[in-house]
Interface confidence: low
């Protein structure tokens, strides 16, 4: 019963510290006194002192608050020795999970994205894709799910609603028909990345589209 | 580098229209890349964004809700300027007037603003 | 309306106080808030846009930070000349201001 199931620690913990995680316990300890002693990244080498152990009492401690960002899993090596330095156990493995707390919000890949769509083109045509990346987790969690929104477009000519976005994939796409370079030649969206699949917490950026010529209107001479 | 220049009377009686004019220099009211915007500041209503105007390849115009029906904002493009008319005026529309220019849209706030023009409405 | 409170309303303080003044939005405004500075008898000056940039000609002991509902903006060692009006406004819909905090000489 060496073995320590793996322990996971939340992110960004309010302590106080050291906060006690788990203890080591070697049933050797009937017949003579343990020591106990962690070894590997995060203990012993860079980055050294974040996690230690009570020589006497085994627990594992943990000395400050950890970053999934940073470093999302820590391998160590607990130790068991006699009074007289001899081994009693072999090296056991500890994984310590950092679990992912929402400290990170989008951020959209450019201030301004910018596209272009041809004038009278039918609803459903895609005009651009637009990204945002979130370095929370998205795998186990929902932080970094980003969800896209169209916040505003302006103009608002002929009405507010000529473009969709997927909220999924970022992609763009006319909704209406009435795309006229004549009248508008240009559209500004605000669009908006929102973590927690939409729930969470949002950044805004610019998409700008142009809308292009059709050659619809003959020459005046 | 750009600058606005207020003009217009200091004084409207009651039920009057306000009228008020912004010369710009160093820009054109019909730039297709800024907003043309009237604000106003009182001690009771603080700073307020009344509306705006824009050019993009034909003329747009925003109107905030608590004055939409008595606000008209107007270009004037061979003077280079554009003007406020405020109808149906009461003494709570006394305030301050400030014409302001938006890069784009506003996204990055109003970083040009006229002087100012008190505007008194009493009988 | 986006609603924007300003606190504290008014704030004294020295030549080279670090001074802090917030701003709450009504409803989440991303990063779509400005600063201005105003002195008696001027019009608004713009210090900061998109919550964080300076205005170019801004002194860089004028920061701005926040997004989502909450705003700060910090100037880190007051000057005669930074003693003012300060309002912010936000403008993800149609544009709305602060009512103002008033800085003055301690």
């Known amino acids: 019963d060496w073995v320590v199931a793996p322990i996971s620690v939340p992110e960004n913990g309010k302590g106080p510290f050291p906060q006690r995680l788990n203890q080591l316990k070697s049933n050797k300890d009937r017949d003579t006194k343990i020591f106990y002693s962690i070894t590997g990244p995060g203990a012993d080498s860079p980055p050294e002192g974040v996690f230690a152990v009570e020589k006497e009492t085994g627990w594992l401690l943990l000395n400050k608050p950890l970053d999934r960002e940073e470093i999302a899993k820590y391998e160590l090596f607990g130790h068991a020795v006699s009074e007289n330095g001899a081994s009693v156990e072999d090296p056991m493995n500890i994984s310590i999970i950092v679990t992912d707390q929402n400290d990170h919000k989008p951020k959209f890949t450019q201030d301004t994205f910018r596209g272009s769509v041809l004038e009278g083109v039918l609803p459903g045509t895609s005009v651009m894709q637009v990204t945002a990346t979130d370095e929370d987790d998205a795998i186990y969690t929902y932080n970094g799910v980003v969800a896209y929104s169209i916040h505003s477009q302006e103009p608002k000519d002929p009405h507010d609603l000529m473009f969709t976005i997927h909220r999924s994939t970022g992609t763009i796409s006319v909704i209406s028909s009435g795309l006229d370079r004549e009248k508008v030649p240009e559209y500004t969206l605000t669009i908006q990345a929102t973590d927690m699949d939409g729930d969470g917490s949002t950044t805004t950026a610019v998409a700008v589209v142009e809308i292009l010529d059709a050659n619809d209107n003959a020459p005046m001479f | 580098q750009v600058q606005l220049q207020q003009s217009g009377p200091g004084l409207v009686k009651p039920s009057q229209t306000l009228s008020l004019t912004c010369a710009i220099s160093?820009?054109?009211?019909?730039?297709?890349?800024?907003?043309w915007n009237w604000i106003r500041q009182s001690p009771s209503r603080g700073l307020e964004w009344l509306g705006r105007?824009?050019?993009?390849?034909?003329?747009?115009?925003d109107y905030a809700l608590s004055v939409k029906s008595r606000i008209t904002i107007n270009p004037d493009t061979s003077k280079n300027q554009f003007s406020l008319q405020l109808n149906s005026v009461t003494p709570e529309d006394t305030a301050v007037y400030y014409c302001?220019?938006?890069?784009?849209?506003?996204?990055?706030?109003?970083?040009?603003w006229g002087q100012g023009t008190l505007v008194t409405v009493s009988s | 309306d986006i609603q924007m409170t300003q606190s504290p309303s008014s704030l004294s303080a020295s030549v080279g106080d670090r001074v802090t003044i917030t701003c709450r939005a009504s409803?989440?405004?991303?990063?779509?808030l400005a600063w201005y500075q105003q002195k008696p008898g001027k019009a608004p000056k713009l210090l900061i846009y998109?919550?964080?940039n300076l205005q170019s000609g801004v002194p860089s002991r004028f920061s701005g930070s926040g997004s989502g509902t909450d705003f700060t903006l910090t100037i880190s060692s007051l000057q005669p000349e930074d003693f003012a009006t300060y309002y912010c406004?936000?403008?993800?819909?149609?544009?709305?201001f602060g009512q103002g905090t008033k800085v003055e000489i301690k």
């Open positions: 302001a220019r938006g890069e784009g849209y506003g996204r990055e706030g109003f970083a040009i």
């Open positions: 160093g820009d054109s009211v019909s730039s297709q890349s800024a907003a």
């Open positions: 105007i824009y050019y993009r390849s034909k003329w747009y115009n």
């Open positions: 409803q989440t405004i991303s990063n779509t």
């Open positions: 998109a919550a964080s």
């Open positions: 406004q936000q403008y993800l819909s149609w544009f709305t």
